[in-house]
Interface confidence: medium
């Protein structure tokens, strides 16, 4: 399965687009490059949107994109590109990465149905062994671009809504 590449800080270059799916962008001998979130269809001879084939199990060229798309549609999850995996925020709230902040902080504001260890943590009963109190200090916010915590994935407003919907 191929990894969903990341947009570079300061906009996208041709390199970003060509190498967005480092091992899965190219199909056939033609070696045609397609913009991000698209794949080369050798039969049609054109670039096609990955979204159109996400439901087709046999299609591997967009696997990473489709996986990240379905991941972002799930509440309280984010896609980590280095791990190439969908991560559940609910399971790591308390010492959560920045990309879980919205989900975890909202969860803590409404303590109903919180697991006991998180309820205790909220009321200060749990041993404070968090080492990430300043872990994201100095990570500047860059508008619609993700911080290094969600490396290089450029999110539009509706995609942000998807991440946290």
């Amino acid at each position: 399965m191929s990894g969903l590449g990341r947009s570079r800080r300061g906009g996208r270059s041709r390199v970003d687009q060509e190498e967005r799916f480092p091992q899965g962008l190219w199909t056939g001998v033609a070696m045609r490059s397609c913009p991000e979130e698209q794949y080369w269809d050798p039969l049609l001879g054109t670039c096609m949107s990955c979204k159109t084939i996400c439901n087709h199990q046999s299609q591997r060229t967009c696997a990473a994109f489709c996986r990240s798309l379905s991941c972002r549609k799930e509440q309280g999850k984010f896609y980590d590109h280095l791990l190439r995996d969908c991560i559940s925020c609910a399971s790591i709230c308390g010492q959560h990465p920045k990309q879980c902040a919205y989900f975890c902080e909202n969860k803590l504001r409404s303590p109903v149905n919180l697991p006991p260890e998180l309820r205790r943590q909220r009321s200060g009963e749990v041993e404070n062994n968090s080492d990430n109190s300043g872990r994201y200090q100095g990570l500047e916010h860059r508008g619609s671009e993700a911080s290094p915590a969600l490396p290089g994935l450029k999110l539009s407003a509706d995609q942000v809504a998807l991440v946290y919907s």
Partner: antibody, heavy 118, light 107 residues
Framework: QVQLVQSGAEVKKPGASVKVSCKAS????????MHWVRQAPGQRLEWMGY????????KYSQKFQGRVTITRDTSASTAYMELSSLRSEDTAVYYC???????????WGQGTTVTVSS | DIQMTQSPSSLSASVGDRVTITCRAS??????LNWYQQKPGKAVKLLMR???RLHSGVPSRFSGSGSGTDFTLTISSLQPEDFATYYC?????????FGGGTKLEIK
């Protein structure tokens, strides 16, 4: 403070298996992904695989697929890496490393030397 | 996989020297470049993440720069404890890959 303490050196015969442990302390074990990286003599660091913190999900390097198994014991805050069908080229120092969710490994174990020799 | 190439592979320098180590990626990795320090028999230490952000406890004589495919780690004034092997690693995409290392020795 965060600490990853690994098990001691091992000497194994070709064809055998080795299981290395990595005990974590100073943080909530289930909140971070644990990776395993190895370094053969004179070689670069080589990523082997990882285990997700909350559901035992694993992903392995293609190079080690089928020979490596990463597990964990949450109650003991310990991760394990087992490598089977050992060969002489598996002689290396094996490290566990905590993933910081930002693309880097912020804390590493001290390393476990595994020697494969007949 | 993204290939990471470090140079030089070894380097002799004296205490007080300014030293620069370079790392090149086989494809654009933005700023997702990390640096580690390794001493014999010791745990590997993260020095710098995301090209230029010092990890906690790392002295300010260490600095990093670059973007895209070319990166540098600079030690402004070498101290005795800095003699070690340094590795770069790309955190841009799966799987994580490391450079071949630069061994910094006392001249």
């Amino acid at each position: 403070q965060v600490q990853l303490v690994q098990s001691g050196a091992e000497v194994k015969k070709p064809g055998a298996s080795v299981k290395v442990s990595c005990k974590a302390s100073g943080y909530t074990f289930t909140n971070y992904v644990m990776h395993w990286v190895r370094q053969a003599p004179g070689q670069r660091l080589e990523w082997m695989g990882y285990i997700l913190p909350y559901n035992d999900g694993t992903k392995y390097s293609q190079k080690f697929q089928g020979r490596v198994t990463i597990t964990r014991d949450t109650s003991a805050s310990t991760a394990y890496m087992e490598l089977s069908s050992l060969r002489s080229e598996d002689t290396a120092v094996y490290y566990c490393a905590r993933y910081d969710w930002e693309g880097s490994f912020d804390y590493w174990g001290q390393g476990t030397t595994v020697t494969v020799s007949s | 996989d993204i290939q990471m190439t470090q140079s030089p592979s070894s380097l002799s320098a004296s205490v007080g020297d300014r030293v620069t180590i370079t790392c090149r990626a086989s494809q654009d990795i933005g700023n997702y470049l990390n640096w580690y320090q390794q001493k014999p028999g010791k745990a590997v230490k993260l020095l710098m993440r995301y090209t230029s952000r010092l990890h906690s406890g790392v002295p300010s004589r260490f600095s990093g720069s670059g973007s895209g495919t070319d990166f540098t780690l600079t030690i402004s004034s070498l101290q005795p404890e800095d003699f070690a092997t340094y590795y770069c690693q790309q955190g841009f995409t799966f799987p994580p890959t490391f450079g071949g290392g630069t061994k910094l020795e006392i001249k």
